[in-house]
């Protein structure tokens, strides 16, 4: 009678086991083991027992002990069951961002692992079990569907295998996949709201604001603002479920024309975009041209106004005839025209908006000098010892220099308060001089003595 010990063994893959083959007779002709496994017979006392070390056990095996005794030959099998945890436990790849309300299919694949009868696959959200199934097939596959909710944001989904060898006196061996962290999001179907100037002048700055409500999680939203090929750098302000992105936009002559202003909001794997056209225009102020900015009295002056080819101008309130980008007027310069403003107003229609630009030039008229009775009376009569201020105003452009002298030497203090004395009496020659020439006028001062009163 041949016996084997142990009759059943569960061992880790690649492991070793000691198997004892025994026979009931004292002097067996033969005692051994039949196995494809690498084996070593160990030293033992006696002849009716042999111990074999079987090594590198990779799969289930049934070594057979045999003996040959005088009463015949017999055999006995031992059952070696190999256990090993799966070589691969993996969740099928999924986009990390999932929209709220979508059905998400989690698929776990398990390669290897034995004995399969003791192997279970568990799908989890955090520590909560979603599904538990025995591992079937190679690779084993377990799937479950999850309706994505807002409160799933940041949740870790994983797949775990459980090789339960506790009934065999061993432990529970667990293998867990790399977690899949779910990022949930809500991006409303409404496009972002874009507020910007419809028209923008070259070499100026404008402000663009893009905003959207009903986002989750708003902090993860990416906002891209661009004008044509120019990426804008907005300052983003976040609310509970909204954002407002504000950017400053500068345009140059190269941007002139119709440009696309875009605001794109990207959240998860979705995006919403708003497009708007902005017309970039160049509209220099109209040019007011005077024949000469400074002319002498009596000179003929041409005043011209020139503006953008598509503009319509008015010169000093008078529209161009015909209506267009040029207007002019002719005048003979008079002293009254000195300091006169010539104002040109140009109007340009850009994308349905009227843009106004003004330019003003001043005319300087050179005239004089003048000394007339109104401003420089020819005769003054003042009581002696009275306080008087001699007044004589010379006119002209440029303002003339005025001197009033008696006998070529004694000055009349023009504009100063003086006490009237006999010395003040007499005829003064007032001379007004400027680059335009000079004029003279005689002024007589009479002093009334008290004795004549």
């Amino acid at each position: 009678q041949t016996s084997v010990s142990p009759s059943k063994v569960i061992l880790p893959r690649g492991g070793s086991v000691l198997v004892t083959c025994s026979t009931s007779c004292d002097q067996p002709k033969l005692l051994g083991i039949e196995t494809p496994l690498p084996k070593k017979e160990l030293l033992l006392p006696g002849n009716n027992r042999k111990v074999y070390e079987l090594s590198n056990v990779q799969e289930d095996s049934q070594p057979m002990c045999y003996s040959n005794c005088p009463d015949g030959q017999s055999t006995a099998k031992t059952f070696l069951t190999v256990y090993w945890t799966p070589e691969r436990v993996e969740l099928a790849p999924l986009p990390s961002w999932q929209p709220v309300g979508k059905n998400l299919t989690l698929r776990c694949q398990v390669e290897g692992g034995a004995p399969r009868a003791n192997l279970t696959v568990v799908l989890l959200r955090g520590e909560k079990e979603l599904k538990r199934e025995p591992a079937v097939g190679e690779p084993a596959e377990v799937t479950t569907t999850v309706l994505v909710r807002r409160d799933h944001h940041g949740a870790n989904f994983s797949c775990r295998t459980e090789l339960d060898l506790r009934p065999q006196g061993l432990e529970l061996f667990e293998n867990t996949s790399a977690p899949y962290q779910l990022q949930t999001f809500v991006l409303p179907a409404t496009p972002p709201q874009l507020v910007s100037p419809r028209v923008l002048e070259v070499d100026t700055q404008g402000t663009v604001v893009c905003s959207l409500d009903g986002l989750f999680p708003v902090s993860e939203a990416q906002v891209h603002l661009a004008l044509g090929d120019q990426r804008l750098n907005p300052t983003v302000t976040y609310g509970n479920d909204s954002f407002s992105a504000k950017a400053s936009v500068s345009v140059t002559a190269e941007d002139e024309g119709t440009q696309r202003l875009t605001c794109a909001v990207i959240l998860g794997n979705q995006s919403q975009e708003t497009l708007q056209t902005v017309t970039i225009y160049s509209f220099p102020a109209p040019n007011v041209i005077l024949t000469k900015p400074e002319v002498s009295e009596g000179t003929e002056v041409t005043v011209k106004c020139e503006a953008h080819p598509r503009a319509k101008v008015t010169l000093n309130g008078v529209p161009a005839q015909p209506l267009g980008p040029r207007a002019q007027l002719l005048l003979k310069a008079t002293p009254e025209d000195n300091g006169r403003s010539f104002s040109c107003s140009a109007t340009l229609e850009v994308a349905g908006q009227l843009i106004h630009k003004n330019q003003t030039r001043e005319l300087r008229v050179l005239y004089g000098p003048r000394l007339d009775e109104r401003d420089c009376p020819g005769n003054w009569t003042w009581p002696e010892n009275s306080q008087q201020t001699p007044m004589c105003q010379a006119w002209g452009n440029p303002l003339p220099e005025l001197k009033c002298l008696k006998d070529g030497t004694f000055p009349l203090p023009i504009g100063e308060s003086v006490t009237v004395t006999r010395d003040l009496e007499g005829t003064y020659l007032c001379r007004a001089r400027s680059t335009q020439g000079e004029v003279t006028r005689e002024v007589t001062v009479n002093v009334l003595s008290p004795r004549y009163e």
Epitope: K39, K40, E41, L42, L43, L44, P45, G46
Partner: antibody, heavy 121, light 107 residues
């Protein structure tokens, strides 16, 4: 550290019984798997295995000398005793005791220095 | 009973590889060990369980065992390796030694 030392008579007369003691330290014969054995080496000749006793008191003997050998142990004294009856001049040899750390694998990792026993009248 | 057969002597030049064989019926089915013995000294275990090396034994000593032959290999042999080498195995219920090989390091 593991040490073994053989002791016994240096000279034995033919037909007498030889008693050798192996006193060891650094391990215990009550530890599972451990054994102590005897080996001899006649002058200028090869090693010859004699006997072995293990922690479980299982005894192993050389087939050719089995009838003359007895091995025993005193676990409390850390001693193993070998007796060999009917000594003959051909039994003149250095006798070694050695430790088997794993008896079933049969190798001897630490040896005593040996004691020379001469059989002569 | 199993008998272990070794060549009586092996010679090797310093730095070369020495190989000492030990043959016996189905020896590969059992564990083999190797001992080094220098004159006037007790044997020292150099290889056990076919190929394992005890601590303190130089890496140049290695062993193998399959079929009917166990082999002790000494790579880069040094003068101090000159000694007698014994293989050892078992045939339950007894332990067996080979006849020993004298290794001579030339020069």
């Amino acid at each position: 550290q593991v040490q073994l030392k053989e002791s016994g008579p240096a000279l034995v007369k033919p037909t007498q019984t030889l008693t050798l003691t192996c006193t060891f330290s650094g391990f215990s014969l009550s530890t599972s798997g451990v054994g102590v054995g005897w080996i001899r080496q006649p002058p200028g000749k090869a090693l010859e295995w004699l006997a072995l006793i293990d922690w479980d008191d299982d005894k192993y003997y050389s087939t050719s000398l089995k009838t003359r050998l007895t091995i025993s142990k005193d676990t409390s004294k850390n001693q193993v005793v070998l007796t060999m009856t009917n000594m003959d001049p051909v039994d003149t040899a250095t006798y070694y005791c050695a430790r088997y750390p794993v008896t079933q694998r049969s190798y001897m990792d630490v040896w005593g220095q040996g004691t020379l026993v001469t059989v002569s009248s | 009973d199993i008998e272990l057969t070794q060549p009586p002597s092996v010679s090797v030049a310093p730095g070369q590889t020495a190989r000492i064989s030990c043959s016996g019926d189905a020896l590969g089915d059992k564990y083999a060990s190797w001992y080094q013995q220098k004159p006037g000294q007790a044997p020292v275990l150099v290889i056990y369980d076919d190929s394992d090396r005890p601590s303190g034994i130089p890496e140049r000593f290695s062993g193998s065992n399959s079929g009917n032959t166990a082999t002790l290999t000494i790579s880069g042999t040094q003068a101090e390796d000159e000694a007698d080498y014994y293989c050892q195995s078992y045939d339950s219920p007894q332990v067996v030694f080979g006849g020993g090989t004298k290794l001579t390091v030339l020069g």
